[in-house]
């Protein structure tokens, strides 16, 4: 038997992926466990194998279909179960009725690129990945810029309160190396959270022209 406190958290990427993390204090490391997804009004169900990510937590991705296919709607409720093998039987360790569009975490933005760079400013664009057409333009973004000698945690957050897939960074220092990241969140969903940060985009501002006041 497995005792201790259990936490089972899942997020839907709005298209065809549910990612889950199960934490269990005192769980047995060698136990084979899986997540089972059973939608209330669909003909399919899906399973993924929980793999350890730390001493007492496991994660897996339920792949529901092609990455850009709309596999669940706002009306769907999915019963999610953690099942662990005990001898020849499967034991239910955790269960939840999951409303996918109340528990959203989108994929990190992709295809970051410098559109235009000057001495003091830089225009950067990006794309969102595997985001449902349901959201229309109702998304928000956070961005941050890593300056020399600072950490990501120290970088101030810039908020874009609409679906704007570009930003113009101002008041930069000439001839300086920076890094930039962005993340996205839909307005929809009580338990919705920010996407992971994008891969950092490195760029360098242009040097100030010689003899010019900077």
């Amino acid at each position: 038997a497995v005792n201790g406190t259990s936490q089972f958290t899942c997020f839907y990427n709005s298209r065809a992926n549910i990612s889950c993390v199960w934490s269990q204090d005192g769980a047995l490391q060698d136990t084979s466990c899986q997540v089972h997804a059973w939608p209330d009004r669909r003909r399919w169900n899906q399973t993924c194998e929980l793999l350890p990510v730390s001493q007492a937590s496991w994660a897996c991705n339920l792949i529901l279909g092609a990455p850009d296919s709309q596999k669940l709607t706002t009306v769907d409720i999915v019963t999610l179960r953690v099942l662990c093998r005990e001898g020849v039987r499967w034991r239910v360790m955790a269960i939840q009725d999951f409303k996918p569009f109340e528990n959203l975490r989108l994929m990190a933005p992709i295809s970051l690129q410098v559109v235009h760079v000057e001495t003091h400013r830089c225009n950067i664009s990006w794309e969102i990945s595997q985001a449902s057409h349901y959201f229309e333009r109702h998304l928000e973004f956070e961005a941050r810029t890593l300056s020399p000698g600072h950490t990501w945690e120290e970088a101030p957050l810039l908020t874009l309160k609409q679906k704007q897939e570009w930003i113009c960074l101002e008041t930069l220092t000439p001839d300086t190396q920076y890094e930039f990241q962005v993340r996205v969140k839909p307005l929809q969903g009580e338990f919705t959270t920010w996407s992971p940060w994008s891969q950092p985009l490195a760029f360098r501002t242009k040097p100030a022209a010689l003899g010019k006041d900077t």
Partner: antibody, heavy 117, light 107 residues
Amino acid sequence: EVQLVQSGAEVKKPGATVKISCKVSGFNFKESLIHWVQQAPGKGLEWMGWIDNEAGETEYAPGFQDRVTITADTSTDTAYMELSSLRSEDTAVYYCARGGPWFLSYWGQGTTVTVSS
Amino acid sequence: EIVMTQSPATLSVSPGERATLSCRASQIISNNLHWYQQKPGQAPRLLIIYGLQSISGIPARFSGSRSGTEFTLTISSLQSEDFAVYFCQQSNNWPYTFGQGTKLEIK
């Protein structure tokens, strides 16, 4: 500019079927949801259902499920709502609207349907 | 089915004054509440989504707030074009339902 233009007023007898069209422009119809809402004099606004043109799925409100059919023709960017077995309480203005599933961002001008013997 | 109750049914306010419209849900709906304005002979127009997020192009005098299952639409300084019927709508549980409306009239 986003536009939804609905077909004209209809007068129908009880038991008949009405089919209303909604021609859209100014956005990608194939990636949109088109909804239908009834506004009857005594009943207020009622959400009838929607069609998801990308997924090819429909969703109907339980109160209309047995009598309503929502379809779309992506070649003409037109959505349709068919209501059958009409009764006097179906006398109402019917709106098509565009939006995500949760709220309605743009509306058609409405189509008045009168059911009378 | 979630029942949305709006109050008052009719609200009489003078131009330039503040109007406060209320909408209560019969069960918890998180922030899944949206507001519309409808003028006579016209289709409804979306004003506010998720309880408090203003829609682009809607004047800043329109604002929304939430306390539990009670939602409020506030119009800070009424203009002549604001006199209309206002509906709330929940999107927490399908079928999504509307309130019966509050008619805002000139005092």
